[in-house]
Interface confidence: low
């Protein structure tokens, strides 16, 4: 398709060389073409005007993007030829930075009414170049961590090293969607919620006596609860004797839940207690069985192939250790009687 | 630029309490880990601890039960107390950033930013 | 608390050489390691972390390896600002802890 009439935007990408950072483009479609395609929907459904030329169309994925090559090659689907590259709905996301993302970047509606097709497109210019000022590398990272129900700022990592004063108008984007009130190279948050986790993209406009273009920034941002004061508490075995079959398999599974720590290295184990020796087993791995904010709950199993005599003279010790301390739980197997 | 720079006594009694602070400039101290590390003349680095913005803080063991880190957002500082001090205390005392370095799923802490040092010595 | 070992204390080599340093862990710390560059009466300087990411205005020539426990930093041809010493850390749990470092002297 003809793309010398689509819209065109450039934007600068400097990616810090020490973190594996994200980029996102945006199909800034023109209005009021846009509206109809992306969740950044300006028009309530009852507002969209009538002319719109793309009606039908209510897929939020329903735009298609291509790189147009350097050497004149025709448009290429970036869903083919780029696997680094993803497309969500209507932003294209960049998982690593790298000088060879620099390019022309085109996205338009896959359905199209042939009247509009050269209107409806917008060309994205995107130039990627690591940073070069060493000191500002320390300045603001592109993964923040905000502590749920304290007071945080998120940083414009493109704009942290200059100060508040100097800095220029600031747009917002939080997972895609605009800030409209957020203007400046912070957003200050007076408390912190679980919703304020998300990804935020940050762009200002830089201009010299030729051009100007957008330089843009995407920062992840978690919410963290503090660092538990807690050992892991172990939710099962809860009983310290197990009725059993001679002859059969067993499995007795150990779950434990581990409190929220920065640098997380949970032990779950299992060890067997026979009169004055002790022995650690060797079971399958532990698995992640539920995971939020606060807490992590982790469970290893142990399995036996089949339940001897000898197993019911031992002690099966689960034993889970954080960074606080540990907990045991041991389980003494009976014979089932009757 | 993030700068720090430490700040305090460089004489301290025995059995007295050692107090340092440390200044942030060129950046907010919200949304990081901020450490002290210790150094005694001629040895290696030891770790005391950390300090959230939010208050949050994780010490070493070692010192536990001597060491308190608090911080000020309104003065961009962060401080360390260590109580009943001895000789073994002498030290240069740094105070540094602890920053995660995204990785894809994780991230891997490094202390990037560190002050110049402020050389504590215990003696009566 | 994991140990860090480095290996050797110190050594002594000429600018050009290639040097490499070893650190061991007590037990697995996974990529979870970083290495520090200190110069007499600086502070320490950030080079490495998760083992063999080399921070940026790092030179090529240094380089780190490993995981589990144990871990290198090569500098591939020496020179003459490189004379230091060096400490490897761990992140991977609580209580962070340092090597006792490598003392790189000129021969």
């Known amino acids: 398709f003809n793309i010398s009439g689509c819209s065109t935007k450039k934007l600068l990408w400097t990616y810090s060389t020490r973190s594996e950072e994200e980029f996102v483009l945006f199909c800034d479609l023109p209005e009021p073409q846009k509206s109809h395609f992306c969740h950044r929907n300006r028009l309530s459904p009852k507002q969209v005007p009538e002319h719109l030329p793309f009606m039908g169309s209510n897929d939020l994925s329903d735009v298609q993007w291509y790189q147009q090559p350097s050497n004149g090659d025709p448009l290429e689907d970036i869903r083919k030829s780029y696997p680094h590259i993803i497309q969500d709905k209507c932003t294209l996301h960049f998982l690593t930075p790298g000088v060879n993302n620099s390019g022309s970047y085109i996205c338009r509606p896959k359905m199209i009414k042939s009247p509009y097709d050269v209107a409806c497109c917008v060309k994205m210019i995107l130039e990627v170049k690591p940073q070069t000022n060493a000191s500002c590398e320390y300045s603001a990272s592109h993964k923040q961590d905000l502590l749920l129900g304290s007071t945080g700022s998120i940083s414009c990592p493109s704009l942290s090293c200059q100060s508040d004063a100097q800095s220029p108008a600031v747009t917002w984007y939080k997972n895609g969607k605009l800030l409209s009130v957020e203007r400046s190279n912070r957003i200050v948050v007076d408390e912190v919620y679980d919703y304020h986790q998300g990804t935020y993209v940050c762009d200002y406009t830089q201009s010299d006596t030729v051009s100007s273009w957008t330089v843009r920034a995407v920062v992840q941002v978690r919410t963290i609860v503090g660092d538990t004061k807690l050992k892991p508490d172990i939710l099962d075995p809860v009983e310290d004797t197990l009725e059993v079959e001679l002859g059969k398999p067993l499995t007795i599974s150990c779950k434990a839940r581990f409190g929220f720590e920065r640098v997380f290295n949970p032990v779950i184990k299992w060890y067997i207690k026979d009169s004055d020796l002790e022995w650690e087993v060797s079971v399958p791995e532990a698995k992640s069985i539920k995971s939020t904010l606060k807490d992590e709950i982790i469970e290893r199993n142990i399995i036996l192939e089949k339940v001897t005599q000898r197993d019911l003279r031992r002690k099966f010790v689960c034993f889970v250790q954080n960074s606080i301390g540990n907990t045991t739980q041991s389980v003494q197997l009976k014979e089932k009687r009757g | 630029q993030v700068q720090l720079q430490e700040s305090g006594p460089g004489l301290v009694k025995p059995s007295e309490t050692l107090s340092l602070t440390c200044t942030v400039s060129?950046?907010?101290?919200?949304?990081?880990?901020w450490s002290w590390i210790r150094q005694p003349p001629g040895k290696g680095l030891e770790w005391i601890g950390y300090?959230?913005?939010?208050?949050?803080?994780n010490y070493n063991p070692s010192l536990k039960s001597r060491v308190t880190i608090s911080v000020d957002t309104s003065k961009n500082q962060f401080s360390l107390k260590l109580s009943s001090v001895t000789a073994a205390d002498t030290a240069v005392y740094y105070c540094?950033?602890?920053?995660?370095?995204?990785?894809?799923?994780?991230?891997?802490?490094?202390?990037?930013?560190w002050g110049q040092g402020t050389t504590v010595t215990v003696s009566s | 608390a994991i140990q860090l070992t480095q290996s050797p204390s110190s050594l002594s080599a000429s600018v050009g050489d290639r040097v490499t340093i070893t650190c061991r862990a007590s037990?697995?710390?996974?990529?979870?390691l970083a290495w520090y560059q200190q110069k007499p009466g600086k502070a320490p300087k950030f080079l490495i972390y998760?083992?063999?990411s080399l921070e940026s205005g790092v030179p090529s020539r240094f380089s780190g390896s490993g995981s589990g426990t144990d871990f290198t930093l090569t500098i591939s041809s020496l020179q003459p600002e490189d004379f230091a010493t060096y400490y490897c850390?761990?992140?991977?749990?609580?209580?962070?802890?340092f090597g006792q470092g490598t003392r790189l002297e000129i021969k």
């Open positions: 540094a950033r602890d920053v995660g370095i995204a990785a894809r799923n994780s991230y891997y802490y490094v202390m990037d930013v």
């Open positions: 060129g950046g907010s101290i919200n949304n990081y880990y």
């Open positions: 300090i959230f913005y939010s208050g949050t803080t």
């Open positions: 037990q697995g710390i996974s990529s979870a």
């Open positions: 998760e083992a063999s």
């Open positions: 850390q761990q992140f991977n749990s609580y209580p962070i802890t």
